[in-house]
């Protein structure tokens, strides 16, 4: 009798261990990736990110996955995502092509499944960066909750990409996952 | 019989009452932190912001701790961290010494362990504000998703700082803990 | 014997079902609302946003309410509200007005018990929208953690509606609840 | 040595004319705001006008508004202060000063030229 | 604008007493951002006092600023003879920047 109550407590241990995990919050996927300057684009069009760190410093990824330039969603659920890119210019790099830039960002879901690519969020500014000043900066963030599902990509694009700054704590992205989907 | 099951029983529930205030929300850490514009530093150089409050207002805190300026974190986990910093000046409030501006937030962590500090995030723009206009204002806003440690302290560094808006919905911080650590 | 202890068994099965369900991610309350831009006013003057979609698009809302432009909390709760606000301007759509220009937004809480509204975060800047460049743009984010009640509103007022960027990727302001209020 | 020598000053009509000029050394002058600051005979202390290290912005007290121009050239290392309509009330020691720099805001003086005396009458 | 009241007009002290000097202020000035000069005859101000209480380069010790708000003091804690001249206060927290009328510390 006693051996049957024990069996019956591990079933419900056991059940209840499976709700409990999905429930706690250590298997929610999330991601931090940090730009790698060493394979910045140059030129001041529009171009996607592909080069990013995601294992070192303050960069890092758990139940997502980072795959050719694009971060890709391993587990459906709803997402808060978000990005941070600065740009500048110092006199010592060079003059200027244009005192007039156009400095954004567009964060864009990829599905594979059906191909098509689309905007999620976009952010920037006009800047007008005389040669008068010998140092120029501009910061955007962007961020949003949006529903992502699995085999999905994440990707980063920007104008002007030789304007980046290379720093981790500068040109970042990221996403983490707030709610399963009902 | 029936006593030994409710013992068994009870002791089920206890082990998961336990389980389940881990993985419930309430337990979470969060700050919410405005500026206290009683004590803020003049001058342009850039300086770290150690006057906030954090019970009046829109302002909060629960499960971490604020001291010296520092938020600092009580539980192991991985946390949404974010900063609003508005500046901004009025003709009336002085004349611009400069009409050049570095208009900066950088968002600090400091361990006590081993003693550094190491910024993670950074936002801002280099601004031109002219004499010719009475009133100029610029906000930043930064965001993202940092694993922090029991014991390391977060902080605010800006330039400028005579020129924060000193209201509580324009210049704030806070985190909020999304994920225990694996 | 057998039966009773299964008959324990459901007992605990089912308070643990509620409470695992509370737990839960899936209850959380969200929101992310696009600008409906068929509706935007016009002028230059601070106006409340009252057009947006909720269910188009990346638009979509789960547990909150969507009512004559306010976002509606249903459940007491912290949340984490963001808003991102762009504002465009080409030489095509004729002259501006002035090219000094505060691009502004305010996310605004109304409680309905106590009459009252409160701006939860503000962001923004001064611009100098020159007619030598013939395009012009501007985003501001903005995002914060509170406390919100059942019955509260969020809205979302600006500066100069007319020169908003109508697309969804744009304009758009959200929340979702992190955790619950002890 | 921060050293600044006015010059310029003298005797004129009401409704006249005059330049000062400020001459700056022991600094990198481009870098600072500047002002001019009056001590009528006997009385005390009153700022006229300030600008910006680049020269770009100007400010001036409600006295002077649309008389007086502040300007610099700062190949010259030299601040100017032009002054036009001139009225009895705006004689004075005119002293040119530096702003410290240490703020974004124009804040104290330091330090002060020896001043030079403008006297409107006729 | 701001104006600033100096009080007392004339201080009469001898050498080794304590001058305290008052300046008040018609609001209250953002940040507490006011400066002491002293000015001899025949001689430019001179600066001695910034940020309501931070010493100048180069300035004694026995000079000292205080206060917050609408009112500040400047103390002299013991003087010196070359201490005797008038002193004004300036505020820089609002436009335009204005000055005190002045105290004139005389020996007695």
């Known amino acids: 009798g006693s051996q049957h109550i024990r069996a019956e407590k591990a079933m419900v241990d056991g059940s209840w261990l499976d709700l409990a995990k999905r429930s706690k919050l250590e298997a929610q996927p999330f991601a931090h990736l940090t730009i790698n300057a060493t394979d910045i684009p140059s030129g001041s069009h529009k171009v996607s990110l592909s080069s990013w760190y995601h294992d070192r410093g303050w960069a890092k990824i758990s139940n997502m996955t980072f795959s050719n330039g694009k971060l890709i969603v391993n587990q459906d659920g709803f997402y808060y995502l978000y990005a941070n890119i600065c740009f500048r210019h110092h006199e010592t790099s060079g003059d200027l092509a244009t005192e007039y830039l156009q400095l954004m960002v567009y964060v864009t879901k990829t599905s594979i499944k059906i191909p098509s690519s689309h905007t999620l969020m976009k952010g920037g500014s006009t800047k007008y960066w005389s040669g008068n000043s010998e140092f120029h900066f501009y910061s955007i963030n962007v961020g949003g909750f949006f529903k992502l599902r699995s085999g999905e990509e994440i990707s980063i694009e920007v104008s002007n990409p030789s304007l980046l700054d290379p720093d981790q704590d500068a040109t970042y992205f990221g996403a983490f996952k707030v709610r399963d989907i009902d | 019989g029936s006593q030994h099951i409710r013992a068994e029983k009870a002791m089920v529930d206890g082990s998961w009452l336990d389980l389940a205030k881990r993985s419930k929300l309430e337990a979470q850490p969060f700050a919410h932190l405005t500026i206290n514009a009683t004590d803020i530093p003049s001058g342009s150089h850039k300086v770290s912001l150690s006057s906030w409050y954090h019970d009046r207002g829109w302002a909060k805190i629960s499960n971490m701790t604020f001291s010296n300026g520092k938020l600092i974190v009580n539980q192991d986990g991985f946390y949404y961290l974010y900063a609003n910093i508005c500046f901004r000046h009025h003709e009336t409030s002085g004349d611009l010494a400069t009409e050049y501006l570095q208009l900066m937030v950088y968002v600090t962590k400091t361990s006590i362990k081993i003693p550094s500090s190491h910024t993670l995030m950074k936002g801002g723009s280099t601004k031109y504000w002219s004499g010719n206009s009475e009133f100029h204002f610029y906000s930043i806003n930064v965001g993202g998703f940092f694993k922090l440690r029991s014991g390391e302290e977060i902080s605010i560094e800006v330039s400028n700082p005579s020129l924060l808006d000193p209201d509580q919905d324009a210049t704030y911080f806070g985190a909020f803990k999304v994920r225990d650590i694996d | 014997g057998s039966q009773h202890i299964r008959a324990e068994k459901a007992m605990v099965d089912g308070s643990w079902l509620d409470l695992a369900k509370r737990s839960k991610l899936e209850a959380q309350p969200f929101a992310h609302l696009t600008i409906n831009a068929t509706d935007i006013p016009s002028g230059s003057h601070k106006v409340s946003l009252s057009s947006w979609y909720h269910d188009r698009g990346w638009a979509k809302i789960s547990n909150m309410t969507f009512s004559n432009g306010k976002l509606i909390v249903n459940q007491d709760g912290f949340y984490y509200l963001y808003a991102n606000i762009c504002f465009r301007h080409h030489e095509t759509s004729g002259d501006l007005a002035t090219e000094y220009l505060q691009l502004m937004v305010y996310v605004t809480k109304t409680s309905i018990k106590i009459p009252s509204s409160h701006t939860l975060m503000k962001g923004g800047s001064t611009k100098y929208w020159s007619g030598n460049s013939e395009f012009h743009f501007y985003s501001i984010n903005v995002g914060g953690f509170f406390k919100l009640r059942s019955g509260e509103e969020i809205s979302i007022e600006v500066s100069n509606p007319s020169l908003l960027d109508p697309d969804q990727d744009a304009t758009y302001f959200g929340a979702f609840k992190v955790r619950d209020i002890d | 040595e921060v050293q600044l020598l006015e010059s310029g000053g003298g005797l004129v009509q009401p409704g006249g004319s005059l330049r000062l000029s400020c001459a700056a050394s022991g600094f990198t002058f481009s870098s600072y705001a500047m002002s001019w600051v009056r001590q009528a005979p006997g009385k005390g202390l009153e700022w006229v006008s300030g600008i910006t290290g680049s020269g770009g912005s100007t400010y001036y007290a409600d006295s002077v508004k649309g008389r007086f121009t502040i300007s610099r050239d700062n190949s010259k290392n030299t601040l100017y202060l032009q002054m036009n309509s001139l009225r009895a009330e705006d004689t004075a020691v005119y002293y040119c000063?530096?702003?410290?720099?240490?703020?974004?805001?124009?804040?104290?003086?330091?330090?002060w030229g020896q001043g030079t005396l403008v006297t409107v009458s006729s | 604008e701001i104006v600033l009241t100096q009080s007392p007009g004339t201080l009469s002290l001898s050498p080794g007493e304590r001058a305290t000097l008052s300046c008040r202020a018609s609001q209250a000035i953002p940040y507490n951002q006011l400066a002491w000069y002293q000015q001899k005859p025949g001689q430019a101000p001179r600066l001695l006092i910034y940020?309501?209480?931070s010493r100048a380069t180069g300035i004694p010790d026995r000079f000292s600023g205080s206060g917050s708000g609408t009112d500040f003091t400047l103390t002299i804690s013991r003087l010196e003879p070359e201490d005797f001249a008038v002193f004004y206060c300036q505020q820089y927290g609002s436009s335009p920047r204005t000055f005190g009328q002045g105290t004139k510390v005389e020996i007695k």
């Open positions: 000063a530096k702003d410290p720099g240490t703020t974004v805001i124009m804040s104290w003086f330091d330090p």
């Open positions: 940020g309501v209480s």
